[in-house]
């Protein structure tokens, strides 16, 4: 039975040209995390962090994506096209797959504040 829950940074905003940290956290389960996948807009793999093999940033994103902190992901040099949904998928044993969602809004305004709070989606 899947007892875990994913907490994420929820809805966040950041400045164009700036950076943002995407974070998910799996709690309330003893399951072993074998791999975490990060996806953009549900159809592009950004990065994978495999427990045994470490991090891989996919070629199309190598210039703008940095691994961490932890199992999170840092997006750099943000553009307006980066606005949208991001998904963390936790592959675990024996529970199976947990998935969290973050919505990022990239703002033109110089007064845009990076708001990040943990919430259960």
């Amino acid at each position: 039975m899947m007892t875990g829950t994913i907490e994420t940074t929820g809805n966040i905003s950041a400045k164009k040209g700036g950076s943002v940290i995407l974070q998910c956290h799996l709690s309330s389960t003893m399951a072993q995390v074998t791999q975490v996948n990060w996806e953009q807009h549900d159809h592009s793999l950004l990065a994978i962090r495999n427990a045994e093999l470490g991090w891989h940033i996919y070629p199309a994103f190598k210039d703008r994506v940095a691994p961490g902190p932890g199992l999170g992901l840092t997006l750099q040099s943000l553009t307006m096209n980066d606005t949208g949904e991001y998904f963390c998928t936790y592959h675990t044993y024996p529970d199976g797959t947990y998935r969290g969602r973050i919505f990022l809004e990239v703002l033109e305004s110089s007064v845009a504040e990076h708001s990040a709070r943990f919430q259960i989606p």
Partner: antibody, heavy 117, light 107 residues
Framework: EVQLVQSGAEVKKPGASVKVSCKAS????????IEWVRQAPGQRLEWMGV????????NYKEKFKGRVTITADKSSSTAYMELSSLRSEDTAVYYC??????????WGQGTTVTVSS | DIVMTQSPDSLAVSLGERATINCKAS??????VAWYQHKPGQSPKLLIY???YRYTGVPDRFSGSGSGTDFTLTISSLQAEDVAVYYC?????????FGGGTKVEIK
């Protein structure tokens, strides 16, 4: 030029072990994964496992756990795949491949392993 | 394990015509699909990764598309040297799994 050169064909008896080598050249050995894939006669390609030569970390397909061991020697830029308790169903061509993480951009020439009594 | 189902099993196409191969994943794999060409007596060769990115040196008649669970490899104008077996592979999660292969021949 990137090259992966594998050891020669092997004929083994059931219950025996086989160790296939894969010597890499033309790139930084520790910057890429080495994956092992096999193809039995008339079957699809089957991924067996992978090693990160830099860290030594490995990941195996569940069905091979306990029977396969993948190692890497950084000093000689060589990876090894040892499969034990061989059975007739292990008769196959065994490939090593360089992993651009989880897809495979260069492949060895293949090593035919025949298991027969 | 994620099951990759390819169709058709074989395909006969006239020279210069289009060949289309489909691959369906048993669960969501985002764009984590690669395509390989395998000729008899040779090692497999990477054509496409991340569903649609053509690997270095691969002719532009080869293209890939799809995301989620449904993927396609297209050879826009079949050449004699394209006769081979083509495999899809998911690189979304371990164990990495391959489709059953599609044999492409000249009609």
């Amino acid at each position: 030029e990137v090259q992966l050169v594998q050891s020669g064909a092997e004929v083994k008896k059931p219950g025996a072990s086989v160790k296939v080598s894969c010597k890499a050249s033309g790139y930084a050995f520790t910057n890429y994964l080495i994956e092992w894939v096999r193809q039995a006669p008339g079957q699809r390609l089957e991924w067996m496992g992978v090693i990160n030569p830099g860290s030594g970390g490995t990941n195996y397909k569940e069905k091979f756990k306990g029977r396969v061991t993948i190692t890497a020697d950084k000093s000689s830029s060589t990876a090894y795949m040892e499969l034990s308790s061989l059975r007739s169903e292990d008769t196959a061509v065994y490939y090593c491949a360089r992993g651009e993480y989880f897809f495979f951009d260069y492949w060895g020439q293949g090593t035919t392993v025949t298991v027969s009594s | 394990d994620i099951v990759m189902t390819q169709s058709p099993d074989s395909l006969a196409v006239s020279l210069g015509e289009r060949a289309t191969i489909n691959c369906k994943a048993s669960q969501h794999v985002s764009d984590g699909v690669a395509w390989y060409q395998h000729k008899p007596g040779q090692s497999p060769k990477l054509l496409i990764y991340s569903a649609s990115y053509r690997y270095t040196g691969v002719p532009d008649r080869f293209s890939g598309s799809g995301s989620g669970t449904d993927f396609t490899l297209t050879i826009s104008s079949l050449q004699a040297e394209d006769v081979a077996v083509y495999y899809c592979q998911q690189h979304y999660n371990t164990p990495h799994t391959f489709g059953g292969g599609t044999k492409v021949e000249i009609k």
